[in-house]
Interface confidence: medium
């Protein structure tokens, strides 16, 4: 902290500018008054501080405001926010998409720092939900923002937002998240025709029960094999040859690369050796022809 | 079969960081999470949190600002880290794979758990 | 979070005995409820799961029923190798969280 010493005279700032950066440290917490700085905050940033300098620009706005800095000074922090810890943020009260953008801006390129988590944290909350706007943006700045929440925070996300993500958003997310945007997606896509629909929702895919999957192989949709092998093991089992043909199309041909991994291994498991003989892709360890098939409990077939 | 093992120091001093790692054999990483689980000496279990294969967590509130587990799938193993521990952190610590290639998840295999004493 | 209330926490039996043991949510979790028996010194083991699904190699003596809120674990005939510690749990949502124990002792 720095000590309590007397303004030289001729030194006391009148407006924040360049002259600041030739002050030394005790000099800048002297001379520049806090309510002047607070007013002038959207200058701070144009000018080369040092991070030394900084330590007490920031040290003098904590004075102002102990209870955490009003919207005002925090829409105009800049590379002063780097400063801030997460203990300051939790005090502020964002509710700007605007103020959200410009403190992004500043750690834009850089993975998301518990500063920045908790500045998202406080403003969705504040927010009540995480509407399209505040995804658009959380998303266009950090990509795997939405598969960084958790599946209680993703039920807060309306089925309108789901419009926002991308592909590519979805990368990093795993089943239980899933489980919970599939139903969202499904809801938020319910009106689109058949092709446009499956571009929309394959993402969301792997948390898709069987009759869904049931469903789509009705409408020709040619699923490729990578969204295949990301779908449900028990929402798959229960499909037949006939259904997985429709619902792979000319992509069938692709379960020989993949007859030894879930869900394709079990699924094989399943089916009887005659029916998966007519895909003419030489998969084995079907049912055995003449064999009775046995209603084995999901577990069992799935160990 | 698949087999877990836990390992890291038994002794911890508060303030200290906690540190454990889980290895895998006799399966793979992918395709399930993996959960780190905790019991106080003659208590219940807590659930402490868990990893993707693909590096996403999830962590209980109750110690998420405390908590960081990391997976390392080269070496089929997955670690935990609890900081500013104290001596309510003292417990046998598990870590155990969720079964969820189907719905409901439920925990198949444990390690079989290692004691650790937060004590100066 | 949802809580999981056991009881009862503890119960005395005799070999042969049919036992329950029961287990309430805080609020609906479907069918998302397992149950674990615990051996001093042990790592729980898997007995049931998705509330009435018996894990492959747990003998036919245990079984698992209910839904929503209210579940139930029972054992038809104790014996010997039954005398532990039980635990239910939610898989329902994070965080996953179990019930307090019933510690199943010998009269």
């Known amino acids: 902290e720095v000590e309590k010493t007397a303004c030289p005279s001729g030194k006391k700032a009148r407006e924040i500018d360049e002259s600041l950066i030739f002050y030394k440290k005790w000099e800048l917490e002297a001379c520049v008054d806090a309510a002047l700085l607070a007013t002038q905050m959207d200058r701070v940033n144009a000018i080369p501080f040092t991070y030394e300098q900084l330590d007490v620009l920031k040290h003098k706005l904590d004075e102002l405001y102990p209870q955490g800095y009003p919207e005002s000074v925090i829409q105009h922090l800049g590379y002063l926010f780097l400063k801030m810890s997460p203990e300051d943020i939790r005090k502020w009260n964002v509710t700007s998409l605007e103020t959200l953008k410009a403190l992004l801006e500043v750690n834009k390129g850089h993975e998301m720092s518990p500063q920045v988590a908790t500045l998202i944290d406080r403003f969705v909350k504040g927010r009540g939900q995480l509407d399209k706007d505040t995804l658009d943006t959380l998303t266009a700045f950090y990509p795997g923002y939405l598969c960084s929440l958790s599946p209680e925070e993703l039920s807060s996300v309306p089925p309108s937002s789901i419009w926002a993500v991308r592909p590519q958003d979805l990368d990093t997310c795993d089943p239980r998240q899933l489980d919970v945007l599939y139903p969202k997606a499904r809801l938020a896509f319910q009106n689109m025709n058949g092709s446009e629909y499956f571009v929309k929702i394959q993402s969301f895919l792997g948390g898709a029960p069987t009759e869904d999957l049931k469903a789509l192989s009705q409408q020709n949709v040619s699923m490729d094999l990578a969204t295949f092998m990301k779908l449900r093991t028990d929402a798959v089992l229960p499909l037949t040859v006939a259904e997985v043909q429709k619902l792979l199309g000319p992509h069938v041909e692709g379960l020989k690369a993949e007859e030894r991994h879930r869900p394709v291994r079990d699924w094989i498991l399943r089916q009887r050796q005659d029916d998966l003989d007519t895909l003419g892709l030489g998969l084995q360890g079907g049912i055995p022809n003449g064999y009775l098939v046995l209603d084995l409990s999901m577990q069992e077939a799935l160990s | 079969q698949v087999q877990l093992q836990e390992s890291g120091p038994g002794l911890v001093k508060p303030s200290e960081t906690l540190s454990l790692t889980c290895t895998v054999s006799g399966g793979s990483i992918s395709s399930y999470y993996w959960s780190w689980i905790r019991q106080p000496p003659g208590k219940g279990l807590e659930w402490i949190g868990y990893?993707?294969?693909?590096?996403?967590?999830n962590y209980n509130p109750s110690l998420k600002s405390r908590v960081t587990i990391s997976v390392d799938t080269s070496k089929n193993q997955f670690s935990l880290k609890l900081s500013s521990v104290t001596a309510a952190d003292t417990a046998v610590y598990y870590c155990a794979r969720e079964w969820i290639p189907s719905r409901p998840y439920y925990f198949d295999y444990w390690g079989q758990g290692t004691l650790v004493t937060v004590s100066s | 979070d949802i809580q999981m209330t056991q009881s009862p926490s503890s119960l005395s039996a005799s070999v042969g005995d049919r036992v329950t043991i029961t287990c309430r949510a805080s609020q609906s979790i479907s069918s998302y409820l397992n149950w674990y028996q615990q051996k001093p010194g042990k790592a729980p083991k898997l007995l049931i799961y998705?509330?009435?699904s018996l894990q492959s190699g747990v003998p036919s003596r245990f079984s698992g029923s209910g839904s929503g809120t209210d579940f139930t674990l029972t054992i038809s005939s104790l014996q010997p190798e039954d005398f532990a510690t039980y635990y239910c749990q939610q898989s329902y949502s994070t965080p996953l969280t179990f019930g307090g124990g019933t510690k199943v002792e010998i009269k």
């Open positions: 990893i993707y294969y693909s590096g996403s967590t």
């Open positions: 998705a509330a009435s």
